[in-house]
C-alpha cells in the first residue's frame, strides 16, 4: 500500500466560530483522521477515516472559545487494521504519520462575518441605525449566543455614512449595536458598517456590510 503522505498546508477556515480545518493533498490508498485536543489535553478523533481534505471542528471549538486548540491530521493506511480507542489511533502498534495544525484560539482567530444593517428608527431629527446581532454556534445552557453575548464590549462597529447625494463621508465607532446621528429632514443617508474586535492586534475587522440608504429602507418597508 506504500507509506501514506503527510498532510500539508493545514489551514483553519473560520467565520463567527463556524470552523473547518482544511489541508492537502487528496489521499490515495490511505485515509485521514483528525484529532483535536480538549481542555483536559485529551485527543479526540474527528472525521474518522475520511478521504476528504477538510474537517468541521465547530462542535469542538465552541465548547470554550477562549481555549487554544491543538489539532493534527493523521494519514492512515487504508488496508491496515486500525483501532480507534477514543483518544488514540494505533496501527499495528505504531502511531501513523501526522502533521500538526497551527494552534487555534477561536476568540482571537475566527473571522468576523459580514454585518447586516437591521433597521433605521427615526425620532425627529435623530436617526438611529441598528446593526443585527447575529447568532453564533456558541451555546450556553442549550441556547445559541449572539456575537455580542460572546464578545461583550470587545465587539464594536465602524459606521461610515454620507448624505445620499454627497461623496463626503463621516465615520464613527460604537461598542453597541446602535448608533444615532443628527439628520436633516427630507434627506437620504447611506450607511456602511464593519464589525471589529477592539482587543485584536490582527484580523480585527469584518468585511463591510452592504450599503443601505434610508430611501431604500422606506421603499423596502413599503412606505
Amino acid at each position: 500500500a506504500g507509506i501514506p503522505e503527510k498532510a500539508f498546508n493545514l489551514t483553519w477556515i473560520s467565520t463567527d466560530f463556524k470552523t473547518i480545518l482544511e489541508w492537502q493533498p487528496k489521499p490515495t490508498n490511505y485515509t485521514y483522521t483528525v484529532q483535536i485536543s480538549d481542555r483536559s489535553r485529551n485527543w479526540k478523533n474527528k472525521c474518522f477515516s475520511t478521504t476528504d481534505t477538510e474537517c468541521d471542528l465547530t462542535d469542538e471549538i465552541v465548547k470554550d472559545v477562549t481555549w487554544a486548540y491543538e489539532a493534527k491530521v493523521l494519514s492512515v493506511p487504508r488496508r491496515n487494521s486500525v483501532h480507534g480507542d477514543g483518544d488514540q489511533l494505533v496501527i499495528h502498534g505504531e502511531e501513523p504519520p501526522f502533521t500538526n495544525a497551527p494552534k487555534f484560539l477561536p476568540y482571537r482567530d475566527t473571522n468576523l462575518g459580514q454585518p447586516v444593517i437591521q433597521q433605521f428608527e427615526q425620532d425627529g431629527r435623530k436617526l438611529n441605525v441598528v446593526v443585527k446581532d447575529s447568532l453564533t454556534l456558541v451555546r450556553k445552557n442549550g441556547t445559541f449566543l449572539t456575537l455580542r453575548q460572546v464578545f461583550g464590549k470587545d465587539l464594536g462597529y465602524i459606521i461610515t455614512y454620507r448624505k445620499g447625494s454627497s461623496t463626503g463621508k463621516k465615520t464613527n465607532i460604537t461598542n453597541t449595536n446602535e448608533f444615532s446621528i443628527d439628520v436633516e429632514e427630507g434627506v437620504s443617508y447611506c450607511f456602511f458598517v464593519q464589525a471589529m474586535i477592539f482587543s485584536r492586534k490582527t484580523n480585527q475587522n469584518s468585511p463591510g456590510s452592504s450599503t443601505v440608504c434610508t430611501e431604500q429602507w422606506k421603499s423596502f418597508l413599503g412606505e
Epitope: 467565520t15 463567527d16 463556524k18 474518522f48 477515516s49 475520511t50 478521504t51 465547530t58 462575518g113 447568532l135
Partner: antibody
Framework: QVQLVQSGAEVKKPGSSVKVSCKAP????????ISWVRQAPGQGLEWMGR????????NYAQKFQGRVTITADKSTSTAYMELSSLRSEDTAVYYC???????????WGQGTLVTVSS | AIQLTQSPSSLSASVGDRVTITCRAS??????LAWYQQKPGKAPKLLIY???ILESGVPSRFSGSGSGTDFTLTISSLQPEDFATYYC?????????FGGGTKVEIK
C-alpha cells in the same frame, strides 16, 4: 422544527438553465451546510453539491462540476441551486436538505420538480 | 467515490413481519452511515444516523447496526405506515452517496 421551503415547479427547454431556491428560517441558517439532492422519476437519490453560507465554501459532485452553481444569500436565509445546459435527463425532483451535526440530512425541503422538454 | 450497494432492491412483507435491509460500502466508512424512509411524492425522512442512532421521534421498531463496510436496517415488526422505500447514505467523505434503495411492499 426547521422548515425548508423551495420554489415552485419549472418547465424548461433543453440547453437552458434553471435556478431553484430554498428558504430556511432565520437564525443559524448561515452556519449549516445546505446540500442539493436530486431524484429522477422512479430513480434513487443523487447528491449534487453543498454550500456553507457563512464560509462561502461550496463544492460539487464531479458529475455536475461546471454545470451546477450553488449560492446562498445570508440576508434572506436562502440557498440557490442553478443548473445550466439542461438536458432531458435532468428532469427530476430537486431537494435542498440541511446537513446535521455531521453530513446526514436532518431536514429536507418539499422538493421542486424540474421538467426539461422541448 | 464511495459506492453503496443495497439489498434487496425490493421485498414483499406482511404487517408484523421482521424486515432486514443491508447496505454494503465499497470501502471502510467507520460508522458514518444514515438510513432514510421515503414515501411516494414526499421528501426522504431521516431514521438513523451514525449507523445505529435513532433520530428523535422515530419509532423504536427501527434499528440500525454495523460499521466499516456492512450495515443493516431492521424493522422489528412491520406496521402499515412502514411500506415505503428505504435508502442508506454514507457521510464519511464527499461526494456524499446513497444506496440504490429498497422498496418494501405489502405481500
Amino acid at each position: 422544527q426547521v422548515q425548508l421551503v423551495q420554489s415552485g415547479a419549472e418547465v424548461k427547454k433543453p440547453g437552458s438553465s434553471v435556478k431553484v431556491s430554498c428558504k430556511a428560517p432565520r437564525g443559524t441558517f448561515s452556519y449549516y451546510t445546505i446540500s442539493w439532492v436530486r431524484q429522477a422519476p422512479g430513480q434513487g437519490l443523487e447528491w449534487m453539491g453543498r454550500i456553507i453560507p457563512i464560509l462561502g465554501v461550496a463544492n460539487y459532485a464531479q458529475k455536475f462540476q461546471g454545470r451546477v452553481t450553488i449560492t446562498a444569500d445570508k440576508s434572506t436565509s436562502t440557498a440557490y441551486m442553478e443548473l445550466s445546459s439542461l438536458r432531458s435527463e435532468d428532469t427530476a425532483v430537486y431537494y435542498c436538505a440541511r446537513e446535521g451535526d455531521r453530513r446526514y440530512f436532518d431536514y429536507w425541503g418539499q422538493g421542486t420538480l424540474v421538467t426539461v422538454s422541448s | 467515490a464511495i459506492q453503496l450497494t443495497q439489498s434487496p432492491s425490493s421485498l414483499s412483507a406482511s404487517v408484523g413481519d421482521r424486515v432486514t435491509i443491508t447496505c454494503r460500502a465499497s470501502q471502510d466508512i467507520s460508522s458514518a452511515l444514515a438510513w432514510y424512509q421515503q414515501k411516494p411524492g414526499k421528501a426522504p425522512k431521516l431514521l438513523i444516523y451514525d449507523a445505529s442512532i435513532l433520530e428523535s421521534g422515530v419509532p423504536s421498531r427501527f434499528s440500525g447496526s454495523g460499521s466499516g463496510t456492512d450495515f443493516t436496517l431492521t424493522i422489528s415488526s412491520l406496521q402499515p405506515e412502514d411500506f415505503a422505500t428505504y435508502y442508506c447514505q454514507q457521510f464519511n467523505s464527499y461526494p456524499l452517496t446513497f444506496g440504490g434503495g429498497t422498496k418494501v411492499e405489502i405481500k
